[in-house]
């Protein structure tokens, strides 16, 4: 069964910078990835970026840079302009879609005990699965 993993990390050099890493574990090719925060896409979450493997990416503040790391994983750099680092308590969700077969989504957040620069362990929390 396909799965999605999500990792959130705080940059050691800039405490106001976060990076979300997401990956798809399963067969098939990915046709679209949506990253949202505050909850799953379409269920209270706000879109941060949409990535297409051929057509490029679209992103919205506070997303700074969205990019493909491999054919089945992406990263999204975030710039926190506020002083209180609200990202530390935020849930980030990644939805991987393979049109028209289905989509898979998981969410993750930075563990409260995380030290700057240390990556959070994979925390797949399946939200939505294709039939």
């Amino acid at each position: 069964t396909p799965e999605v993993w999500v990792q959130v990390q705080m940059e050691a050099t800039e405490l106001s910078s976060f990076t979300v890493h997401c990956g798809f574990l399963g067969p098939g090719s990915i046709s679209l990835v949506t990253v949202s925060w505050g909850g799953p896409d379409g269920a209270g979450g706000t879109k941060l970026a949409v990535l297409h493997p051929e057509l490029g990416t679209r992103q919205w503040a506070p997303a700074r840079q969205a990019r493909w790391e491999t054919q089945s994983s992406i990263s999204l750099a975030l710039e926190d302009s506020g002083a209180s680092s609200p990202f530390a308590n935020t849930t980030f969700c990644c939805k991987f879609a393979s049109f028209p077969e289905g989509s898979w989504e998981s969410c993750g957040s930075l563990p409260p005990s995380s030290d700057p620069g240390l990556s959070a362990p994979p925390t797949p929390v399946p939200i939505l699965r294709a039939d």
């Epitope: 090719s29 679209l32 379409g42 297409h52 049109f99 028209p100 077969e101 989509s103 939505l128 039939d131």
Partner: antibody
Framework: EVQLVESGGGLVKPGGSLKLSCAAS????????MSWVRQTPAMRLESVAT????????YYPDTVKGRFTVSRDNAKNTLYLQMSSLRSEDTAIYYC?????????????WGQGTSVTVSS | QIVLTQSPAIMSASPGEKVTMTCSAS?????MFWYQQKPGSSPRLLIY???NLASGVPVRFSGSGSGTSYSLTISRLEAEDAATYYC?????????FGAGTKLDLK
């Protein structure tokens, strides 16, 4: 301007075959997933075939699987639907539609439709 | 496959009124779309991904919902809005449509 123009519809007897065409223009045809959607006399819409990845992957609902075949010729910017073993319930207006990736694969452009009547 | 149930099947409203129609899914939906179809014409995309307006669609149209419950709202009805409205989903194949809501003007 994006245009999709279907052709090939007509009257056919039950058990017969028909091949529909959809000529595309105004966009890079090979970059887009395409679908055939039919509208029954009761005005219900039903997706009957979808083709992606340059024609490698095709998808059909159970109602037409094994009877309909979707294909595309990217050099000719044309989408096809080969229909065989036709039944009266296949009577409908057949539309071709384009899926826009960044609109989450919504069908953002539709042709004008071609009518298929299956009757003895 | 996911079955979409639209309600009401037929509705009538006056120009200037606010109108809401719903689309209920038999199981949770990943992506929801709305189309408008006028007699003798092909369907036209109105809303993509639940709530985003397609190009050229007036701002009086809006979409909302999540999971299995979705709706399309027209804030101030105009004469040109008389049409049949269809919801459509893709979560896994096959792509499916609702039976439509026919909107007539009084």
């Amino acid at each position: 301007e994006v245009q999709l123009v279907e052709s090939g519809g007509g009257l056919v007897k039950p058990g017969g075959s028909l091949k529909l065409s959809c000529a595309a223009s105004g966009f890079t045809f090979s970059n887009f997933a395409m679908s055939w959607v039919r509208q029954t006399p009761a005005m219900r819409l039903e997706s009957v075939a979808t083709i992606v990845n340059g024609g490698i992957n095709t998808y059909y609902p159970d109602t037409v699987k094994g009877r309909f075949t979707v294909s595309r010729d990217n050099a000719k910017n044309t989408l096809y639907l080969q229909m065989s073993s036709l039944r009266s319930e296949d009577t409908a207006i057949y539309y071709c539609a384009r899926h826009d990736d960044f609109l989450y694969y919504a069908m953002d452009y539709w042709g004008q439709g071609t009518s298929v009547t299956v009757s003895s | 496959q996911i079955v979409l149930t639209q309600s009401p099947a037929i509705m009538s409203a006056s120009p200037g009124e606010k109108v809401t129609m719903t689309c209920s899914a038999s199981s949770s939906v990943s992506y929801m779309f709305w189309y408008q179809q006028k007699p003798g014409s092909s369907p036209r995309l109105l809303i993509y991904d639940t709530s985003n307006l397609a190009s050229g669609v007036p701002v009086r149209f809006s979409g909302s919902g999540s999971g299995t419950s979705y709706s399309l709202t027209i804030s101030r009805l105009e004469a040109e809005d008389a049409a049949t409205y269809y919801c459509q989903q893709w979560t896994s194949y096959p792509l499916t449509f609702g039976a439509g809501t026919k909107l007539d003007l009084k």
